[in-house]
Amino acid sequence: APPPINKLALFPDKSAWCEAKNITQIVGHSGCEAKSIQNRACLGQCFSYSVPNTFPQSTESLVHCDSCMPAQSMWEIVTLECPGHEEVPRVDKLVEKIVHCSCQACGKEPSHEGL
Amino acid sequence: APPPINKLALFPDKSAWCEAKNITQIVGHSGCEAKSIQNRACLGQCFSYSVPNTFPQSTESLVHCDSCMPAQSMWEIVTLECPGHEEVPRVDKLVEKIVHCSCQACGKEPSHEGL
């Protein structure tokens, strides 16, 4: 995929942006006590464009799409207490902790790299 | 797909934008005289966000991605002259003529609706 676009010559005053915003995330599981954890969400406005196509195609279709998604994240275990469940007194859930966000190609799978 | 987002409560000063810009498109075919035609390209900054995931998933993954793409286009024949090609004196190419652009779900196939 081509590199993300941060600036466009046609719109010099416009910049792509993609931020990691602090959020409080509720982690829950049926029959267990929910936990609030501090996390981050990715939010932004990346550039996209679409140039008219032809048949037969003369070149590769000129369509570009960037999306604001995690650039670095890690998965942590959050343990929930489940009172009244003797068989399953505790439940482990994996939670994605987002570290950094960036504009990346829309089709791309978000990175889940450790630190 | 959820409807495109134009405003975000977290960023009240930010707006999604997606414009149809006039362009001159060169339509060519090997051995034929290229033609310049007036067309439009879509260009913009739509909103995207990504909320941390969990395993097992508690809810649907909260990932949203809009992209600036044709909302209305039609395909027209552009005929190229091919001097010196007795067998193929003319070549027809289909060219997408973009009418309007809008922020639409990233995975969506661009619309090729008539007027």
Partner: antibody, heavy 121, light 110 residues
Framework: QVQLQESGPGLVKPSQTLSLTCTVS??????????WSWIRQHPGKGLEWIGY???????YYNPSLKSRVTISVDTSKNQFSLKLSSVTAADTAVYYC?????????????WGQGTMVTVSS | QSVLTQPPSVSAAPGQKVTISCSGS????????VSWYQQLPGTAPKLLIY???KRPSGIPDRFSGSKSGTSATLGITRLQTGDEADYYC???????????FGGGTKLTVL
């Protein structure tokens, strides 16, 4: 002289995928001088154009069928194929493959003899 | 309902002349070339006319095509019994972004 021959099952069950192949003889698909098409004709009705393919693999589909249609080319076998997914009784028709006059849109100068496809359980 | 409008049927005696009309709009016939096809019973269509008025090799000059504005006409002179067939007009439609055909005209040679 170029000839086209359609082949494939004559009976397809509803919701399944219709698959047809057109074999080109007497000329090469990869010469690049022609567009290749699929066209269908419902019983006792007119003609409906389905889509185009070029030897390079570039395709263009009728927007009314686009979500269900895939046309592909195999230049090594001198064949091009049609796949139509999620078929219903409304897809029962004679299916023709055709060649356009040299790189002209909509002037089909050579046709296969057609193959009748019935969609029924 | 076809995008291009043709009369369902026409008839004439052997040796006579007949015309078949094809009516459309500016998004199809008005701005694109028209082709005509002959379909004999039980056979595949055969190209008679392309680029409004050109005949492929092997098509006799009894067949002619013309176009004016958003309508096209196929003419057949010196009618023969072997001309009994369905005739279709076809062109590109920019608004529909697709190739389109008329509903067909059945020619009967009396």
């Amino acid at each position: 002289q170029v000839q086209l021959q359609e082949s494939g099952p004559g009976l397809v069950k509803p919701s399944q995928t219709l698959s047809l192949t057109c074999t080109v003889s007497g000329g090469s698909i990869s010469s690049g001088g022609y567009y290749w098409s699929w066209i269908r004709q419902h019983p006792g009705k007119g003609l409906e154009w389905i889509g185009y393919i070029y030897y390079s693999g570039s395709t263009y589909y009728n927007p009314s069928l686009k979500s269900r249609v895939t046309i592909s080319v195999d230049t090594s076998k001198n064949q091009f194929s049609l796949k139509l997914s999620s078929v219903t009784a409304a897809d029962t028709a004679v299916y023709y493959c055709a060649r356009d006059a040299p790189l002209r849109i909509g002037a089909f100068d050579i046709w296969g003899q057609g193959t009748m496809v019935t969609v029924s359980s | 309902q076809s995008v291009l409008t043709q009369p369902p049927s026409v008839s004439a005696a052997p040796g006579q002349k007949v015309t078949i009309s094809c009516s459309g709009s500016s998004s199809n016939i008005g701005n694109n070339y028209v082709s005509w096809y002959q379909q004999l019973p039980g056979t595949a269509p055969k190209l008679l006319i392309y680029d409004n008025n050109k005949r492929p090799s092997g098509i006799p000059d009894r067949f002619s095509g013309s176009k004016s504005g958003t309508s096209a006409t196929l003419g057949i002179t010196r009618l023969q019994t072997g001309d009994e067939a369905d005739y279709y007009c076809g062109t590109w439609d920019s608004s529909l972004s697709a190739g389109v055909f008329g509903g067909g005209t059945k020619l009967t040679v009396l």
